[in-house]
Interface confidence: low
């Protein structure tokens, strides 16, 4: 055999006797008719030897070490060559050794091709006999960050200030690339970083630094999962002991893109976290040991990659194919953060996307899919618009506002319904009628329903909320002057079981001036609340709106104001309110900034109440709350 | 972005009451806790106590016990200070910084409020 | 209640030289300390927390160290933009306690 090892190259080439085995007769190496037990080889080097026996993979070793110096000079970076190459060397057990030293904020990383490495334990050995041990240093002292074989999903390691990669490869194995490579990062102001990728279900077991010697004092050591999106990480702990700590507190700590509460934080006998969906960061942080009594801290864990259970595995239909202008969005509910982890949440399109959120549009078919220990943490908001651009067209069309079966059969709450109910200015306006009689929700009387339609004026510069109503009340129809949305807005799952109360019909109808006018048709057994739009934050200025209230021919209507003076100081104009019988057109007039407010009123007949507001002066603004109760008449006036 | 908006300069007399005011946007209020630090003229700062955001309990350090309340609105993200009985040494800047309970450190500031009290 | 003892109190340092700013604690407060940096007219700004950790938008410049009772803030090359007081602060138990400040000025 020849071995010629160039100058400058930095390689050293040892062989040794390997473990004694029991074999009878010895072996030597022969160089220059010498019988030697060992010969190194440095660069500059060339020598020719054979050995003394047929078999001298059973008696020898070669070790090949490459001393890499990035603290002189630029690093060789790139894919790491095999030197001297394995064809040229003795069939021998062989030890490829590269010592990298750097400076202590120069990152290196080392990279493995496919395929990545799985992480064995004390006393395990590599199917194939190949194996690499990769070790770093902290100052002068060497830790072992572990020792690998082929086919896992270790992909990249990252250390600073110099690394120590030993591959070993049994005489018989065919391999002559290395491969990995080295390339140089940023400080990562740790021990070391290990990446581990998954590109399906599998599972990867990883220890700390030293294992099962302890990890170094003080120091943090950080492992990244890749994991698909549509795949869970549970994390469990197969063994590990704890330091006697003086300062600080070991601890593990979870960091998952796109938590609100990162890191997580655990303690190590605390349960780990499960079910997490896509990518992750699992950090070890030691402390300060007891001078005396220091203990060992070390690690040794399990990432279990699979498909998602239950609910994950049912695709759902969501048909909007034949929906126009209307998007639906699946998303997390607000809450409020805690400490504890919180596993991920993840709504998938066709079973591949997988997000937090989703938004699927009208005119197509869409097929969806939850990863999701809890759907309770995902809720949806749709919006839909209809519009009219010809009033020509539109006069007298109705359409009926129903959220679609599809999308109640969706395993998740509905949090809103909006439909945006566009009209061309000035030409018309809207009239919402109910399947069933609606209730304005007030302090007073509040809904206690699963869902409520919150209505809207949908005009960007007017800030006109109508209010919130809900079924079972008086209210027989709204109608508004101009563009207005809608919005049904669930409270409680058992909208569900009460999807069939819902039921608005919206229609378009000649244009009028006033804001707004409820249509109001008062039951004999109950008190009928009604405020002015905007409540709380006052009517716009120089608004308009009327309610038009039924009586009975048997019944007389009781008209009740809840305050003495409604409040208003107006900058300009004035603000006034009309009830006006409507058999007789009789009217009072009550100057609002002036007047105190009517008392109590009884009404034989049918009447309007008129309210229009002035420009009021800012904190002064107009808010009234009245009632309406029905009772027997006692003689017939009429 | 993460914002604190304080409420403006404040001239009051010694005895009288304040209430200060910090608005929390660009995220959640009650996802962190709301920490209250004073700084009198020319000196430096003083940890006043925090307010848990999520069950609105205040902690307060024991030289601001008594005359100083810390309250919320979460309804309109709004954090609260208020100083009764007003004494001239009360004039400071009164900061209101955003952390966690578990993890103390402040990492977004309001701009503070000047609280002036003189007769 | 942790005290936390900064000095000096004033460093006079010209652009382009290194800061060293100290902070020792009354007793050991293993990592939980942080460094705020303060302008005239202006809020404390976060620079430093747990003693060594950067933050997001801080400069590189700026570093932090110690553990236990002794902590030093490092500017590794004041820039004019630095003359600012530095304060640092326990956050190991209640209450919170700032130090007296460190203020850093032009020479």
């Known amino acids: 055999f020849e071995i010629a090892l160039p100058r400058e190259s930095n390689i050293t080439v040892l062989i040794k006797l390997g473990t004694p085995t029991l074999l009878a007769k010895p072996c030597y190496i022969v160089i220059s008719k010498r019988h030697i037990t060992m010969l190194s080889i440095k660069s500059g080097e060339r020598i020719v030897f054979t050995f003394s026996c047929q078999s001298p993979e059973n008696h020898f070793v070669i070790e090949i070490q490459k001393n890499i110096d990035c603290m002189s000079g630029p690093c060789p970076f790139g894919e790491v060559q095999l030197q001297p190459s394995t064809s040229l060397l003795p069939t021998l057990n062989r030890t490829f050794i590269w010592d990298v030293k750097a400076h202590k904020s120069i990152g290196l990383e080392l990279q493995f091709s496919i395929p990545r490495l799985r992480q064995i334990g004390p006393g395990e050995s590599c199917p194939d006999g190949v194996t690499h041990s990769i070790s770093g240093r902290i100052d002068a002292t060497v830790v072992r960050i572990g020792t690998f074989c082929s086919n896992g999903t270790v992909s990249r390691i990252k250390m600073q200030e110099g690394v120590k990669m030993a591959l070993h490869l049994p005489w018989f194995h065919p391999r002559n690339v290395s491969g990995f490579s080295i390339a140089n990062r940023s400080s990562i102001k740790r021990l070391c970083i290990i990446e581990s990728v998954f590109e399906g279900e599998g599972s990867a077991t990883l220890m700390s630094a030293n294992y099962p010697e302890g990890f170094p004092e003080d120091e943090l050591m950080t492992w990244q999962f890749v994991v698909p999106a549509h795949l869970r990480a549970s994390v469990s702990f197969l063994n590990f002991n704890l330091s006697n700590c003086e300062r600080k507190e070991e601890r593990v700590e979870y960091y998952i893109p796109g938590s609100t509460t990162n890191p997580e934080v655990f303690k190590l006998e605390d349960k780990q976290p499960g079910n997490m969906a896509g990518n992750f960061n699992l950090s070890l942080q030691g402390c300060d040991q007891d001078a005396q009594s220091p203990g060992i801290l070390r690690l040794q864990f399990q990432v279990l990659v699979q498909h998602p259970q239950n609910e994950s595995n049912k695709i759902y239909v969501v048909d909007l194919s034949n929906e126009r202008a209307m998007s639906l969005t699946i998303e997390p509910r607000p809450v409020k953060q805690s400490r504890k982890f919180v596993p991920g949440c993840f709504v998938c399109l066709e079973s591949r996307t997988c997000s937090s959120n989703l938004t699927l549009t009208s005119g197509s078919k869409h097929k969806i899919s939850f990863l999701c220990d809890d759907l309770t943490r995902l809720w949806m908001n749709v919006e839909k618009t209809i519009s009219c651009t010809d009033h020509r067209y539109c006069q007298r069309k109705s359409y009926s506002l129903q959220v679609p079966s599809d999308i109640l059969h969706l395993p998740v709450e509905l949090h809103d319904f909006s439909w945006k109910l566009l009209v061309p200015k000035d030409r018309l306006s809207l009239v919402l009628v109910p399947a069933q009689k609606l209730q304005q929700h007030t302090h007073e009387k509040p809904c206690n329903t699963s869902f409520s339609y919150l209505v809207a004026s949908a005009i960007p510069s007017q800030d006109l909320y109508f209010g919130s109503f809900c079924p079972g009340g008086s209210i027989k129809q709204i109608q508004v002057k101009q563009n207005i949305s809608v919005t049904l807005r669930t409270f409680a799952p058992s909208f569900q079981q009460e999807a069939s109360r819902q039921g608005l019909t919206v229609s378009f109808i000649p244009y009028f001036k006033e804001e707004g006018v409820f249509t109001v048709t008062p039951d004999t057994k109950s008190k009928v609340y009604l405020r002015t739009p905007n409540w709380d934050r006052g009517l716009p200025s120089l608004t308009s709106v009327s309610w038009n209230i039924s009586v009975p021919r048997d019944q007389v209507a009781c008209l009740t104001f809840f305050k003495e003076r409604s409040g208003v100081v107006c900058q300009t104009g004035r603000a006034f309110m009309i009830i006006q019988e409507q058999r007789t057109r009789a009217e009072e007039i009550f100057s609002l900034d002036e007047d105190v407010l009517p008392k109590p009123s009884f009404h034989h007949h049918s009447f309007w109440v008129n309210i229009s507001n002035c420009s009021p002066t800012s904190g002064k603004q107009l808010d009234l709350l009245f009632s309406v109760t029905l009772t027997p008449r006692t003689v017939d006036l009429t | 972005q993460v914002q604190l908006q304080q409420s403006g300069s404040e001239l009051k007399k010694p005895g009288e009451s304040v209430k200060l005011s910090c608005k929390a946007s660009g995220y959640t209020l009650t996802d962190f806790s709301m920490h209250w630090v004073r700084q009198a003229p020319g000196q430096g700062l003083k940890w006043m106590g925090w307010?848990?955001?999520?069950?609105?309990?205040?902690t307060y350090a024991d030289d601001f016990k008594g005359r100083f309340v810390f309250s919320l609105d979460t309804s309109v993200s709004m954090a609260y200070l208020q100083i009764s009985s007003l004494k001239s040494e009360d004039t400071a800047v009164y900061y209101c910084?955003?952390?966690?309970?578990?993890?103390?450190?402040?990492?977004?500031w309001g701009q503070g409020t000047l609280v002036t009290v003189s007769s | 209640e942790i005290v936390l003892t900064q000095s000096p109190a004033t460093l006079s340092l010209s652009p382009g030289e290194r800061a060293t700013l100290s902070c020792r604690a009354s007793q050991s407060i293993s990592d939980f300390l942080h460094w705020y940096q303060q302008k005239p007219g202006q809020s404390p700004r976060l620079l430093i927390k747990?003693?060594?950790q950067s933050i997001s938008g801080i400069p590189a410049r700026f570093s932090g160290s110690g553990s236990g009772s002794d902590f030093t803030l490092t500017i590794s090359s004041v820039e004019p933009e630095d003359f600012a007081v530095y304060y640092c602060q326990s956050a190991h138990s209640f209450p919170y306690t700032f130090g007296q400040g460190t203020k850093l000025e032009i020479k």
């Open positions: 747990y003693a060594s």
């Open positions: 910084s955003r952390g966690r309970d578990y993890d103390p450190h402040f990492d977004y």
């Open positions: 307010i848990n955001t999520e069950t609105g309990a205040p």
